[in-house]
Structures are given as structure tokens and as C-alpha cells.
């Protein structure tokens, strides 16, 4: 058996004399009984204790013997009061009582800082009867105490109705100090003070701290639990940990890390989801935040087609969902786009730029000054314009679209006619003469149809009249544009 | 007013390198690029590269690798031009320019560099 | 790489007289084609830029036109006020690359 140097209650023999009535040599089996399971406890303790005052519930016994003596009152015997011992040792305790045989039926329960004991629990009821009582003994043993164990620890027995209750058993669990608080992995700003806490509990107490700071000791002398350290401020990374000491020996916390927050990192994969004609989608792979979550993003578009201004555009975005549609973009152009987040400390540095192209549209602008006349002696319709400014065209130009819709009492029909890109001249056929021709021309690119030109109309007469002169776009505040030849 | 002031001349050696400057005003000088061209005396003009002020990107053309580096300092707004291991055949008249709406609008007087021993 | 071939070299007209200078690509370049105007001591003068565009400022006696690979400047009634160097400019791709110029002269 273990024994411990700070017993506060010493081992004593486990009966040190025999029962009241009884003879010690009625009792020799009971010298044994605390072994017959093979148990061996690390402590065991005698279920009385001379001279120690009794505080336990007591019962009168209503009954009186054949002599009418009145019987002693019941109470269960004194018993240590105070065990202590280390965490995983064996520990056994018990309870005795002797019970007048007139009594049947009578049982033991243990209690734990006032909760019953039930299931599981390695408890032993022995009797020994004699002539007029019998001996009770409850044993409670436990074959590895943990800290859980700690308790105030009662036995008590039902008669007639009264509860007879022992004195408390003081289980004291003792063992390294076990934390409470640990110290927390935290994100700091660079030079600006923090705290961390470290709290521990024996027992034994008192537990004292120290500080470790990247296997540094950081205070010479302990601190009582709890503790907080408070660190003036850091300029790199540390890892800090805390000691808590006892008369058991000592614990050491998690190292935990203390990050300093800095800027992002640059995002990384910048890439296309989608083009039209004025819009690009990009989406990006965020960088290492810095100890800090991002704010926002900003998207960075460059104009890069070999001659242009290269106007920088910056559009600003929330950091999620990682994606943008930025809008206002010519058509058919080459842009260079980065992206930058930030954080509470800055802005990281701007992602590798990626080229990307919008694609065509349909022109914004239709066809400049468009002209119309009749020559008669062909019998067509010869019509002129101007192509739209290049940077309008909003692609390359594949062709135009004309519109002529003829109109003349009870007739109107529109026909349409696609001619190339090159020259900015067609011929169309006079399909209703003593009629109006109202023509209207697009520009066409691989993107689609702009907007058609404001209508030119001419008067087609009946065969025989004379062609005099063209009809054409009319100037700002015309009202009319139709020239009747 | 856009204004792209070049010094007038430079004399340097054979072997030697040279900085021409370029400080621009009148205009926003990390919005646009800037293009540096060669023309030697009596001949075209050639295309060396652009630096765009307000990340450094550069596109360079190949036959100028290693013979000139184009920088920026954005607190002057100038735009500089480095060329090194100076021979003969880099003398020549070197104008800073800026596009706007499609084409190269606006040019710096040009700064001679002539190397001679 | 792209190309430019510029013609003739140079030239000389009498003044109201038209000029005509022609630029070759070898690779395709749509509308994307610029020319300048460079008189002595001075950088060059931007007259015509892509897609064929009369820059602002710029007499409509100068004019282009082409597309893809072959492109046309043209000066109706020549001024003595002319008399330069002009060059043709691609701006389709990089590297940009320019024309070997043409001299005009004034008889």
C-alpha cells in the first residue's frame, strides 16, 4: 500500500476493538474483509475513531428488551474525517453501525455532497449478526480518484421511518494543477499592448504562474492564479504558454500564437468568367489576409490597346464573393485589370495584371449624313452616307442594313437590303413609281445592328419627270426632311 | 496644358549609359502611359516602349531589351529613360510621347544623346 | 511583328497639285493606321488617327483611307506650307512600328 507524507488522518487498525457487546474474538473473520475481493487500497481507514465528537443524525429505538432496558441510541460509529490523497491512487472508506436485531430489513446508501450514490459505484454492505445486534459495515472504495472524486461523502440508513446520517467523509483529490483558462491564440496590431490570462486549481493550492514567451520565462517571480500578462506590444510573431506550479509538481499550458496583423497579400488568379461588348466578369483567389479579415477590393482596369490613353479606371467591390462585373467598357478592346484588397491595416499590393478583351457589339451610332436621289434615267434610287466614327462602330463594320419603305395611295411596303463594309454607297431599284421612298440605313458588325439613321424621303413622280436634286439627312431643327422632285 | 519637358541634349561616351528625363505636366500622370520613340538623324521614327506610371507595367520592344529600362517617379511626375553600353548607333533624337483618343498627340521636344568619345 | 512598308521615299509636286502616299502592312490591322506630319527641328504632328479620323485642327485637305493591309494618305491641293516628312503609323499590336517616311518637297 502507498502512503502519503501529508496524511491529515492516520491509517489506523481497521478495528481497533471490538463492538459494543461483543467480543473481539467473535469478530475474527472481519480482519479479512477488507481484502476478500483481492482489493488492495491504497488507504484504509478505521470506521471508528476514539474521542472524536459524534455530529451524526441519531435515532431512539421505540422497542425495550426483555429486561426493559432501554435500548442506546443508534448512530453510526465516528470515522475519519479527511482523506486526501493523489489523483489515480486506490482509496477505500467505510461506515459501521450496529443494529439491534429487532430491526429487519435495513440498508445503507451513500451519498455524495448530497446527491445519492447509485449504479456504478463499488459499494459493500457486510453483516455480522451477534445475539442482540448486528454489526453493519458500508465500504466505499474507489480503485483510481480523479479529480471528480473530490466530495463530502455520507452513509445513511432508514429506520422507522428516521434517517440515521454519518459524518462526513472528506475526500481531498490532489494532484497537478489543472487549468481553467488558458491563454488564447490572438491577432494584434504591431506595437500595441494585449492581455492574456492564465488561470489554474489544485489542489493543492496555492497554484502560481509564470509567463513563457517563445521558451523564455517572462516574470521571475510567480503570480498567484489567476493571471493575466499584459505584453506592451509586439513587432513579430511570439508564441506564449504559462506554467502553473503546486507542491505536485507543474502544468504547462497550449503555446498559443500571437499573430501580428498585416497587410494582405496581393490576390492571386485573376481570371475571366465572362466578355460582351461593354462588361467583363473577373473573379480572383484571395491572398493571405494579413491576421485580418478583408474589407473591400478594388478592381483596377487599365486601358492597354497598343495606342490608347490608358486611363485607369478603379472600381471598389465588397471582398466577397470574389467577383465582379465591371461595367462601361468599350467594345473590342484591351484592358489590363488587377485587383487589390484590403484590411484594418492597408491595401495589399495589386495581383498580377491579366489582359482581356471585351468583345464586339452592335454599333452605338447609325451612318453620318445620309443622302438620297433618283436617277431617272436608270430607274434606281442611288443612296450615300458616311460610315459612323470608328470608336462608335463598337467592332469592325461586316456591312449595313437599308430600310426603304415605298408608300403611295393604298400601298406601303418595306424592304430591306445588307451590303458590305466597303464603299459607303448602294443602288436600290425604284419598285413604286408616284410613290415616297423613306430610306434608313444601319451599320452591321459581327455584334449585331446599330440604330438606324433618321429617314431621308424622295418623292418618286411618274415616269417622265425630271430628276432634280437629292434629298438628304436633314440639318439639326428640320422639321420635314422630304424633297419632292 | 499637356507639356512633356526633355532636357535639350546629352553628350556621353562610348560604353557609358545615359538617364533622359521626362517631366510631364498639365495632366493626370498616372493615368497614361507613356511611349519613348528614337529617331536618328535624317531617318524614321521607332517605337522603344511604354510605362504606364501608375503600376510601372512596361511592354517593351524586343530590339530595345537591355538597352533601355524605362522608369517612373511618381512624386516629380517624370518619366525616365536609361541606356546603357552606349555605342554610335545610339545617337539619336529621343522623344517621350503620350497617346490621347487614339493617337500620339502630344511629344516632348526630344533630347539629342550623342555619344562620342 | 508587323511590317510597315511606306512609298514612295520621296517626292516633289507643284503647289494645287495632289499627293498621294501608300503604306503596306504584313499582317492585317483592320483600320488601326495613323500618319504623321514632321517638319524640321520639330517631333512629329499627328494628322490622321485610326479608323481614319481627321484629327481636330488638322486641314480637311488631308484625308486616308484603307483597310487590313492596305492604306492610302492623300493631300488635295498641296500647300507650300506641306513641305515635311510624313510617316504612317500601325497601332493594331505591339511593338508599334512605323513607315520609313516620305519626304515631300514643293517644286
Known amino acids: 500500500a502507498i502512503t502519503e507524507a501529508r496524511e491529515e488522518a492516520k491509517p489506523y487498525p481497521l478495528f481497533p476493538g471490538p463492538f459494543p457487546g461483543s467480543l473481539q474474538t467473535d469478530h475474527t473473520p472481519l480482519l479479512s474483509l477488507p481484502h476478500a475481493s483481492g482489493y488492495q487500497p491504497a488507504l484504509m481507514f478505521s470506521p471508528t475513531q476514539p474521542g472524536r465528537p459524534h455530529t451524526g443524525n441519531v435515532a431512539i429505538p421505540q422497542v425495550t428488551s426483555v429486561e426493559s432496558k432501554p435500548l442506546p441510541p443508534l448512530a453510526f460509529k465516528h470515522t475519519v474525517g479527511h482523506i486526501i490523497l493523489s489523483e489515480h491512487k486506490g482509496v477505500k472508506f467505510n461506515c459501521s453501525i450496529s443494529v439491534p436485531n429487532i430491526y429487519q430489513d435495513t440498508t445503507i446508501s451513500w451519498w455524495k455532497d448530497g446527491k445519492e450514490l447509485l449504479g456504478a459505484h463499488h459499494a459493500i454492505t457486510q453483516f455480522y449478526p451477534d445475539d442482540e445486534v448486528t454489526a453493519i459495515i458500508a465500504s466505499f472504495s474507489i480503485t483510481s480518484v480523479q479529480r471528480s472524486d473530490n466530495g463530502s461523502y455520507i452513509c445513511k440508513m432508514k429506520i422507522n421511518n428516521e434517517e440515521i446520517v454519518s459524518d462526513p467523509i472528506y475526500i481531498e483529490v490532489q494532484g497537478l494543477p489543472h487549468f481553467t483558462k488558458q491563454p488564447e491564440s490572438m491577432n494584434v496590431t504591431r506595437n500595441t499592448a494585449f492581455n492574456l490570462t492564465c488561470q489554474a486549481v489544485g489542489p493543492p493550492e496555492p497554484v502560481n504562474i509564470f509567463w513563457v514567451q517563445n521558451s523564455s520565462r517572462v516574470n521571475e517571480q510567480p503570480e498567484k492564479s489567476p493571471s493575466v500578462l499584459t505584453v506592451p506590444g509586439l513587432t513579430e510573431m511570439a508564441v506564449f504558454s504559462c506554467e502553473a506550479h503546486n507542491d505536485k509538481g507543474l502544468t504547462v499550458s497550449k503555446g498559443v500564437q500571437i499573430n501580428i496583423k498585416a497587410i494582405p497579400s496581393p490576390p492571386t488568379e485573376v481570371s475571366i468568367r465572362n466578355s460582351t461588348a461593354h462588361s467583363i466578369l473577373i473573379s480572383w483567389v484571395p491572398g493571405f489576409d494579413g491576421y485580418s479579415p478583408f474589407r473591400n477590393c478594388s478592381i483596377q482596369v487599365k486601358e492597354a490597346d497598343p495606342l490608347s490613353n490608358g486611363s485607369v479606371m478603379i472600381f471598389n467591390t465588397s471582398a466577397l464573393p470574389h467577383l465582379y462585373q465591371i461595367k462601361q467598357l468599350q467594345a473590342l478592346a484591351n484592358y489590363s485589370i488587377g485587383v487589390s484588397c484590403m484590411n484594418e491595416i492597408g491595401w495589399s499590393a495589386v495581383s498580377p495584371w491579366i489582359l482581356a478583351s471585351t468583345t464586339e457589339g452592335a454599333p452605338s451610332v447609325a451612318p453620318l449624313n445620309v443622302t438620297v436621289f433618283l436617277n431617272e434615267s436608270s430607274d434606281n434610287v442611288d443612296i450615300r452616307w458616311m460610315k459612323p466614327p470608328t470608336k462608335q462602330q463598337d467592332g469592325e463594320l461586316v456591312g449595313y442594313r437599308i430600310s426603304h419603305v415605298w408608300q403611295s395611295a393604298g400601298i406601303s411596303k418595306e424592304l430591306l437590303e445588307e451590303v458590305g463594309q466597303n464603299g459607303s454607297r448602294a443602288r436600290i431599284s425604284v419598285q413604286v413609281h408616284n410613290a415616297t421612298c423613306t430610306v434608313r440605313i444601319a451599320a452591321v458588325t459581327r455584334g449585331g445592328v446599330g440604330p438606324f439613321s433618321d429617314p431621308v424621303k424622295i418623292f418618286i413622280p411618274a415616269h417622265g419627270w425630271v430628276d432634280y436634286a437629292p434629298s438628304s439627312t436633314p440639318a439639326p431643327g428640320n422639321a420635314d426632311p422630304v424633297l419632292i422632285i | 496644358q499637356v507639356q512633356l519637358q526633355q532636357p535639350g541634349a546629352e553628350l556621353v561616351k562610348p560604353g557609358a549609359s545615359v538617364k533622359v528625363s521626362c517631366k510631364a505636366s498639365?495632366?493626370?500622370?498616372?493615368?497614361?502611359?507613356m511611349h519613348w520613340v528614337k529617331q536618328r538623324p535624317g531617318q524614321g521614327l521607332e517605337w522603344i516602349g511604354r510605362i504606364h506610371p501608375f503600376d510601372t507595367e512596361t511592354n517593351d520592344n524586343q530590339k530595345f531589351k537591355g538597352k533601355a529600362t524605362l522608369t517612373v517617379d511618381k512624386s516629380s511626375s517624370t518619366a525616365y529613360m536609361q541606356l546603357s553600353s552606349l555605342t554610335s548607333e545610339d545617337s539619336a533624337v529621343y522623344y517621350c510621347v503620350i497617346p490621347a483618343n487614339g493617337g500620339f498627340a502630344y511629344w516632348g521636344q526630344g533630347t539629342l544623346v550623342t555619344v562620342s568619345a | 511583328e508587323t511590317t510597315v512598308t511606306q512609298s514612295p521615299a520621296s517626292l516633289s509636286v507643284a503647289t494645287g497639285e495632289k499627293v498621294t502616299i501608300r503604306c503596306i502592312t504584313s499582317?492585317?490591322?483592320?483600320?488601326?493606321m495613323n500618319w504623321y506630319q514632321q517638319k524640321p527641328g520639330e517631333p512629329p504632328k499627328v494628322l490622321i488617327s485610326e479608323g481614319n479620323s481627321l484629327r481636330p485642327g488638322v486641314p480637311s485637305r488631308f484625308s486616308s483611307s484603307g483597310y487590313g493591309t492596305d492604306f492610302v494618305f492623300t493631300i488635295e491641293n498641296t500647300l507650300s506650307e506641306d513641305v515635311a516628312d510624313y510617316f504612317c503609323l500601325q497601332s493594331d499590336n505591339l511593338p508599334l512600328t512605323f513607315g520609313s517616311g516620305t519626304k515631300l518637297e514643293i517644286k
Open positions: 499582317t492585317d490591322i483592320g483600320d488601326d
Open positions: 498639365g495632366y493626370t500622370f498616372t493615368n497614361y502611359w
